[in-house]
Interface confidence: low
């Protein structure tokens, strides 16, 4: 038996480890698949990432929905050839996380 | 050239992506190195973790102070012998953090 | 609140080589993106800029003037620094120190340079 | 480099009067980024330069809502809808679209 209370807190520390976007620290040229003469200042950004834990070994935290968020970056290449360039960079937010089967099984397989 | 107020955005943003110790879920068994037939309800729970971002490639966000957090969870063994116990687990929480090399320069390597 | 002073030897002889001190506060050039530049105004005349220095230690100069011109910065004391090589009477003029952003807002009250023989 | 041209060099005005101001540079000041990095700066005796207006039409902050910025490419004016002592001066335009950045040289608002 156990008391109600170690229970409340228990479930809400199991509520706050699910899957779920959390926000997440992101290296934009690695992100990007930028070339290496280019790269960008800052060199990461904040944006929501799915994580967390599923009930079950055979499931992963995957993203079911996305949006694109923009951030102001500088972008410097080099050799540095002129004034380092402020551009938006668009990068992926996940707005909707799932526990999902980690290989979807086809019928035939 | 940039306008101040860009500037004050991207600067805020780069420092919350720096390295810092930041929440983060944990999967206990893992973590313990459990054997196979005792796993934990909840399986994760949040901690405490150094994550971000470091200004040059040649540097890793690394933990330089830890403390040792008591969750209480579920210890369940399989085949179900007993009712589940309420138990105490230890989980690392890094409490400081640092961008340091990647690997140790030792002076006679 | 953002504010710059320029300091310099007030007086100095042709061939010699103009030293300037811009001292500010208000902002760090650690930020990401920060600039502290130079600008010129020879009495009754226009304006020139001539160079700058960025947050990542990078140098802009003035492409006419590129060969006497030196900038540098000590980001912990709150201070940029301009070396001309060579001076002339040519660059008698008020220099201004500025802090580079999109426009200059942000100007020093300028300092006074003589060359005189 | 990029010349600016400001026309007329002094404008002799009465207080009340309207003034304009032109500027015109030697290649377009429209940025790769789609802005154009026009601005205009009024200097009064014995002082730097202030910031009036940048990008073009934008008032800078406490700037009078009687100066006003127009154009696009290479030609851009500036308004005074009705002139006061305040506003004695010289007036630059310059570009920040090319580096190097340039100014133009000057026109000297003054009372007739």
């Known amino acids: 038996f156990y008391d109600i209370e170690t229970l409340k807190v228990i479930d809400e520390e199991w509520q706050r480890t699910q899957c779920s976007p959390r926000e997440t620290c992101v290296e934009v040229a690695s992100e990007l698949g930028k070339s290496t003469n280019t790269f960008f200042k800052p060199p990461c950004v904040n944006v929501f990432r799915c994580g967390g834990c599923c009930n079950e070994e055979s499931l992963i935290c995957m993203n079911t929905s996305t949006s694109y968020i923009s951030k102001q970056l500088f972008e410097i290449s080099v050799p540095l050839t002129s004034v380092p360039e402020l551009v938006p960079v668009k990068v992926a937010n996940h707005t909707g996380c799932k526990c999902l089967p980690t290989a979807p099984r086809h019928p035939y397989s | 050239f940039y306008d101040i107020e860009t500037l004050k955005v991207i600067d805020e943003e780069w420092q919350r992506t720096q390295c810092s110790p930041r929440e983060t879920c944990v999967e206990v068994a893992s973590e313990l190195g459990k054997s196979t037939n005792t796993f934990f309800k909840p399986p994760c729970v949040n901690v405490f973790r150094c994550g971000g971002c470091c200004n040059e490639e040649s540097l890793i966000c690394m933990n330089t102070s830890t403390s040792y957090i008591s969750k209480q969870l579920f210890e369940i063994s399989v085949p179900l012998t007993s009712v589940p116990e309420l138990v105490p687990v230890k989980v690392a929480n890094h409490t400081g953090c640092k961008c340091l090399p990647t690997a140790p320069r030792h002076p006679y390597s | 609140q953002v504010t710059l002073k320029e300091s310099g030897p007030g007086i100095l002889q042709p061939s010699q080589t103009l030293s300037l001190t811009c001292s500010f506060s208000?902002?760090?050039?650690?930020?990401?993106?920060?600039?502290v530049g130079w600008i010129r105004q020879p009495s009754g005349k226009g304006l020139e800029w001539l160079a700058n220095?960025?947050?990542?230690?990078?140098?802009y100069y003035n492409p006419v003037l590129r060969s006497r011109l030196t900038i540098s910065k000590d980001t912990s004391n709150n201070q940029v620094f301009l070396k001309i090589s060579i001076v002339d009477t040519a660059d008698t003029a008020t220099y201004y120190c500025?802090?580079?952003?999109?426009?200059?807002?942000?100007w020093g009250q300028g300092t006074l340079v003589t060359v005189s023989a | 480099d990029v010349v600016m041209t400001q026309t007329p060099l002094s404008l002799p005005v009465s207080l009340g009067d309207q003034a304009s101001i032109s500027c015109r540079s030697s290649q377009s000041l429209v940025h790769n980024n789609g802005n154009t990095y026009l601005h205009w700066y009024l200097q009064k005796p014995g002082q730097s330069p202030k910031l009036l207006i940048y990008k073009v039409t934008n008032r800078f902050s406490g700037v009078p809502d009687r100066f006003s910025g127009s154009g696009s490419g290479t030609d851009f004016t500036l308004k005074i809808s009705r002139v006061e002592a305040e506003d004695l001066g010289v007036y630059f335009c310059s570009q920040s679209t090319h580096v190097p950045w340039t100014f133009g040289g000057g026109t000297k608002l003054e009372i007739e």
């Open positions: 208000g902002f760090s050039l650690s930020t990401y993106g920060m600039g």
């Open positions: 500025v802090q580079v952003t999109n426009p200059f807002v942000f």
């Open positions: 220095i960025w947050w990542n230690d990078d140098k």
